[in-house]
Each structure stands twice: as C-alpha cells, then as structure tokens.
C-alpha cells in the first residue's frame, strides 16, 4: 500500500514527586517502520530512561506505537518526541501550561 | 559529509549589531537543533543558546537572552545567531554546532570570528 | 548552574605518556549528560567522548573515559604528537549547559 504518514500527539500526566509522565503516541502510519523517540534538548534520552509500546494495527490497515517517558516539572521546553517515518520526520514539543495535549499530521 | 559552514570575519563598533549565519550540510536540516557558542580569545567555551528549526523552539542561556536572537530559515536551511548591543567583551569566535543522538554538540562550523572595537 | 572543574590547567607530557584529565562538577549528574571534546589551535571543537565513556566515530581507542556523580576522567594511554591540543569537559544534564574551562596537554 502507499505511505501513511503518522499523527502524532504528546500528553502529559499528572505530577508525581515534581515529576511528569510525557507519552507520545504515534497512529494511523503505514508501512509500520517508525522510529519514535524522545528527545533532551535535542538529544536522544538513554534507552532505560524510555518506554516503548509494541507497533500494533489499529485496525484500519495502519498502526500505532508510544514512547514515554519521565521528566521534571518546569523543564517541559526541554524535551520533543522526534518521530522519523519513510524519509519523513518531525519533532513534537510537550505541551506547556494548561494545555495537555498536542496533536500534528504529518504530510 | 556532514558540514556546517559559517559567514566570514566581522568588525564591530561597540553598540552596534552583528548576524552570524551557519549553513548545515549532509543531513535533513530540521531534524537536529542547532547550537550556538562563543569562544572569548584564549578562554574557554560559553553556551549561547540553541533553536530547534523543525518547530523553532529557542532555548537561551539566560546571560544571553536579552541580546541574542536566533532564528533560521527553512527555505535555504540556515541559521542565524544576532547579538545586539556590542561591547568589547563579545569579542570572540562564534561556533554553531548541530545536536547529535547522543551529545549535545557533534558537528562544529568553523567559526566566526566577531572583533568589537571602536 | 552546575560548575565544571578541570584540573589540571596544563599537563606537561612526552609522547608516549600517559595523559589522566579530571572533570569535577558543583553537582551529580548522570553519566549521560557527561562529554569530552578535543580542541587544537585555529579549529573548532571536535566531539571526543559521549556519555561519558563512549568514543565518537574514528576516535582512537587510546582515548577512553570514566566516572559517575561529580568526579569524571579522560584518559589517553599512550600520547601521540597529534593529540596534545585543550580538552573540555561538558555536561548537558542541566540548563544552562556548561562547559569546564579546559586542560592544556603540552609537549614536555
């Protein structure tokens, strides 16, 4: 089939011991080949400071995945999910103040 | 090749302006931050700020804020570093570098130098 | 702001030495956030060591790195000619990002 580019879209859970769980998940992409990643000032965090979900169809002939991790509260500007997907990429910010959630189609 | 190669040498009266520009090469323009560092003559190096060119996220540091402003171009995948407000002490060689996937400064330009003097 | 502490300012060494660089900083961080970089005259930085003990690409295995929390070491084993040249230590774990004020390796 022909590419999909993913949506992806960046949440923030609630503060835990000043810090904060950011997910970023990734859906709706096709071939299933994606590399999603966060990101410290623009640097990849360490492997054990991230989790990953498996690549899972959605159902629809495409797939979804996450990524999340922990950082701390205040140093939100810091941190991007960086998403590269059949010669695509993009860099997702958290979302800062009131706002929970951030969502971006690639095209 | 990765490259990031910078504008030439300036002069400077005090007060006054002066934009360094710093054109990357060899990889997707957007899809690392670039950083930016001065180099005081014989001293050591001093963190200026980054920008993320993908979502033009600025990061300063915070010495630097009121003065400097980054900004890039996505049409012809440059950088720019300007520092307002000259004084002799912003005499120095201007670094841009790019982010890597494991350290914060991986690939350097070559430099700028930026002489202040009246 | 975490303050980086090389020491010592210069190191006096003949080829074929041995070359021990210490990085101290004000405060821990994670040995993730921990970099080296090789400066010679006239040229811009180059990326030595990653994470604290991790060799750039086409670095010399005769470079490595050590440390954890506030005490990290460069160590060249075996000095060549093109090696004497300012080495920085930088950390990226807090903001702003700081870099040590650099050891000179001389020839003796």
């Known amino acids: 089939g022909s590419t999909v580019p993913p949506m992806v879209n960046v949440t923030c859970s609630e503060v835990s011991e000043g810090n904060i769980t950011v997910t970023c998940r990734a859906s709706s992409f096709y071939p299933r080949n994606i590399t999603l990643t966060w990101r410290q000032d623009g640097v990849s965090l360490s492997h054990n400071t991230q989790q990953w979900g498996d690549v899972l169809p959605d159902g629809n002939g495409t797939y979804q995945t996450w990524v999340a991790t922990r950082i701390r509260q205040g140093e939100e500007q810091r941190f991007t999910c960086y998403m590269e997907h059949s010669g695509n990429h993009g860099t997702h910010p958290v979302p800062s103040g009131n706002s929970h959630h951030h969502h971006h189609h690639h095209h | 090749e990765i490259q990031l190669v910078q504008s030439g040498a300036e002069v400077k009266k005090p007060g006054s302006s002066v934009k360094v520009s710093c054109k990357p090469s060899?990889?997707?323009?957007?899809?690392?931050?670039i950083y930016w560092v001065r180099q005081a003559p014989g001293q050591g190096l001093e963190w200026i700020g980054y920008?993320?060119?993908?979502?033009?996220?600025?990061i300063y540091n915070q010495q630097f804020k009121d003065r400097a402003t980054l900004t890039v171009d996505k049409s012809t995948s440059t950088a720019y570093m300007e520092l307002s407000s000259l004084r002799s002490e912003d005499t120095a060689v201007y670094y841009c570098?790019?982010?890597?996937?494991?350290?914060?400064?991986?690939?350097w330009g070559q430099g700028t130098l930026v002489t202040v003097s009246s | 702001e975490i303050v980086l502490t090389q020491s010592p300012a210069t190191l006096s060494l003949s080829p074929g030495e041995r070359a021990t660089l210490s990085c101290s900083a004000s405060?821990?961080?994670?040995?993730?956030?921990l970099h080296w970089y090789q400066q010679k005259p006239g040229q811009a930085p180059r990326l030595l060591i990653y994470r604290t003990s991790n060799l750039a690409s086409g670095i010399p295995a005769r470079f490595s790195g050590s440390g954890s929390g506030t005490d990290f070491t460069l160590t060249i084993s075996s000095l060549e000619p093109e090696d004497f040249a300012v080495y920085y230590c930088?950390?990226?774990?807090?903001?702003?990002?700081?870099f040590g004020q650099g050891t000179k390796v001389e020839i003796k």
């Open positions: 060899g990889y997707a323009f957007t899809s690392n931050n």
């Open positions: 405060s821990s961080i994670s040995s993730n956030y």
């Open positions: 920008i993320d060119p993908y979502i033009g996220r600025i």
């Open positions: 930088q950390q990226g774990g807090s903001l702003p990002l700081t």
């Open positions: 570098s790019r982010s890597g996937e494991r350290s914060n400064f991986d690939y």
